[in-house]
Interface confidence: low
């Protein structure tokens, strides 16, 4: 019930004035404007975002399980963030740390020349039966952001003329003749359909794909990027590994694929202040405009630090804007000498193709440990997981609206086929909720001065949470 | 993977009642809608009733103030109360779990039979 509170004495307007102040504590404030789409409302839980009726309904609110969670999610969120800055041992100890499990748990040359040998061999084996195909290794093994354990990404080029569905039935076929391989099987239900196997000498898992080709330049644009900024390397292997030891890496259990965390870099380094890599797409193209981003599209690696780029402009964006225009212009007075700005915009994109850097001019001076502390903090506090989009393309930052995608965790837009969300896989609240949990875990344990042979806990996290990510009960979100 | 199982399908006088459960298992959003469907004999499935995560429900005009469902979001289950039935309820009745941003998370039962008898 809404109390009249016209008809309310003195002393009671003052009990009333004393209950929303204790609710303002809970973060539950008194609306001065009442929304009309909740006319019988009279408060606000700026911490839920929920409108509330009246005081008991305010009281039943905080009681309730999401509103509690939120509240330690609130005072969690400003623990972490009053924690010292770290001093420069503090960085310099983290710095070692990273290079060390980058050397420790990262693939040596060696290791990648045996998996370059498992795709030689491969061919042979393949090309005998199907002459027309070539084999390439694509991946983490080629962006040498491999671990020692991951798979082995093979691709098959294949003619135009060639059925996929058929071309990886022949393929399995072949490796299951082959005594090279053991363990040979089908996955052709895969969001990628794959054969997989395992090579017999050297006990790694491969993965055969068939024309994976938005797969092969990721790995590309991810390797060229390896090559030319330093810290990129240790800084995804350091994640990755993470990543594997808190288990939110397997895709098959709801993780998030693998090269995920080298977007998830890539696009950190590009969005910290100062940035240590360039978006691909920007204003030193003459004619963009980060609204029509979509009409540029994004189409391989040349001479290993530029990223070529497309415009395509039959596309609807083009054709909406091209009609806007021309009714603006039927709008106008006519006036020859007078260039509107939408026409300059739309004679500015000239330039139909072009490259793009992948580094910035000014070298890069901060310690590693520093970005790998930059990097917890940045997916943990300052950038909203939930509302915004991972896009390595533009320097703005994406709304879920800007690409219509609603209802996942996390989106991360794969670069070469833009309407994909490469993080689609995470698609439980249960599963997101831990993934943040692990990001402050981190971040707090990364964070903080730790002694030697001090508390492990926080950065072997199998034994609690593998329980918990692989568990099915749904989330409720009260 | 999701998997859902209904129960309490069977045969009824026309005039009588039925209560429909679906038991939804795997890995399901928190906030998606449940609801039911149903398909009689050479005719196409067809939608009866849905019911949004915060309870709201929409039904099909054949079945309003006949049928009811409702869902336990704790125990991933949906209901459909179905009272006063007719022989041109008699369908296979299926439950179906689903995002209606994203077509391809949707999820069928197997369906449960139905029988109203004149």
């Known amino acids: 019930t809404v109390i009249d509170e016209s008809a309310l004495t003195p002393e009671q307007r003052l009990g009333l004035k004393q209950a929303e102040e204790r609710l303002e504590r809970d973060h539950i404030f008194r609306l001065e404007k009442r929304s009309p789409e909740y006319t019988n409302c009279r408060y606000l839980c700026k911490l839920c975002l929920i409108h509330i009726e009246n005081i008991q309904g305010a009281h039943k609110h905080i009681k309730e399980k999401r509103h509690k969670k939120n509240i330690l999610e609130k005072q969690e969120e400003s623990e972490l963030r009053s924690l010292p800055s770290p001093s420069s041992a503090h960085l310099a100890a983290l710095s070692v740390a990273v290079v060390e499990l980058a050397k420790e748990q990262g693939i040596t040359d060696d290791d990648l020349r045996i998996r370059q040998d498992i795709v030689e061999e491969m061919s042979k084996v393949i090309m005998t039966f199907l002459p027309e195909c070539s084999l390439r290794l694509y991946g983490s093994s080629l962006t040498k952001f491999a671990l020692k354990s991951s798979d082995v990404n093979i691709d098959i080029k294949f003619p135009p003329k060639m059925n996929h569905p058929d071309l990886l039935i022949q393929v399995l076929g072949i490796l299951k003749k082959s005594a090279l391989y053991i363990d040979v099987e089908s996955d052709f239900h895969a969001k990628v359909p794959v054969v997989v196997c395992k090579d017999r000498k050297s006990a790694l898992l491969c993965r055969v794909s068939a024309g994976n080709d938005m797969a092969c330049l990721t790995t590309d644009l991810l390797a060229a990027l390896g090559k030319v900024e330093p810290v990129f390397t240790p800084l995804v292997l350091a994640f990755r590994y993470w990543a594997k030891l808190c288990y939110i890496d397997s895709q098959t259990d709801g993780g998030i694929p693998s090269y995920c965390f080298a977007l998830m870099v890539m696009f950190f380094l590009q969005q910290r202040k100062p940035p240590l890599l360039p978006c691909l797409l920007g204003s030193w193209i003459e004619g963009f405009d980060p609204k029509r981003m979509d009409d540029f599209q994004l189409k391989g690696i040349v001479e290993e630090k530029f990223v070529k780029w497309e415009y395509n402009s039959s596309s609807a964006t083009e054709k909406n804007l091209i009609a806007d225009e021309n009714k603006a212009k039927a709008d106008e007075p006519k006036d020859d000498t007078k260039k509107t700005e939408t026409d300059n915009q739309s004679n500015a994109a000239k330039a139909k193709h072009g490259k793009s850097p992948l580094t910035l001019e000014a070298p890069n001076q901060v310690p590693l440990g520093q970005l790998w502390l930059e990097l917890l903090k940045f997916y943990t506090l300052d950038f909203a997981l939930e509302e915004y989009v991972i896009c390595v393309r533009i320097q703005d930052i994406l709304t879920r609206e800007n690409k219509n995608w609603p209802k996942r965790r996390i989106a991360i837009e794969d670069p070469f086929s833009v309407k994909r969300n490469v993080a689609r896989s995470l698609n439980s609240q249960l599963v997101y909720e831990y993934v943040v949990e692990r990001f402050r875990a981190a971040y707090r344990y990364f964070a903080c001065p730790q002694k030697k042979g001090g508390n492990k806990s926080t950065m072997d996290p199998k034994k609690k949470e593998k329980g918990k990510l692989s568990s099915k009960k749904p989330v409720k979100s009260d | 993977q999701v998997q859902l199982q209904e129960s309490g399908g069977g045969l009824v006088q026309a005039g009588g009642s039925l209560r429909l459960s679906c038991a939804a298992s795997g890995t399901i959003f928190y906030d998606v809608i449940m609801g039911w469907y149903r398909q009689a004999p050479g005719k196409e499935r067809e939608f009866v009733a849905g019911?949004?995560?915060?309870?709201?429900?929409y039904y099909a005009d054949s079945v309003k103030g006949r049928f009811t469902i409702s869902r336990d979001n704790a125990k991933n289950t949906v209901y459909l109360q179905m009272n006063s039935l007719k022989p041109e309820d008699t369908a296979v009745y299926y439950c179906?779990?689903?995002?209606?941003?994203?077509?391809?998370?949707?999820?069928w039962g197997q369906g449960t039979q139905v029988t109203v008898s004149s």
């Open positions: 179906a779990v689903g995002d209606p941003t994203d077509p391809s998370y949707y999820y």
């Open positions: 019911i949004t995560y915060g309870g709201t429900t």
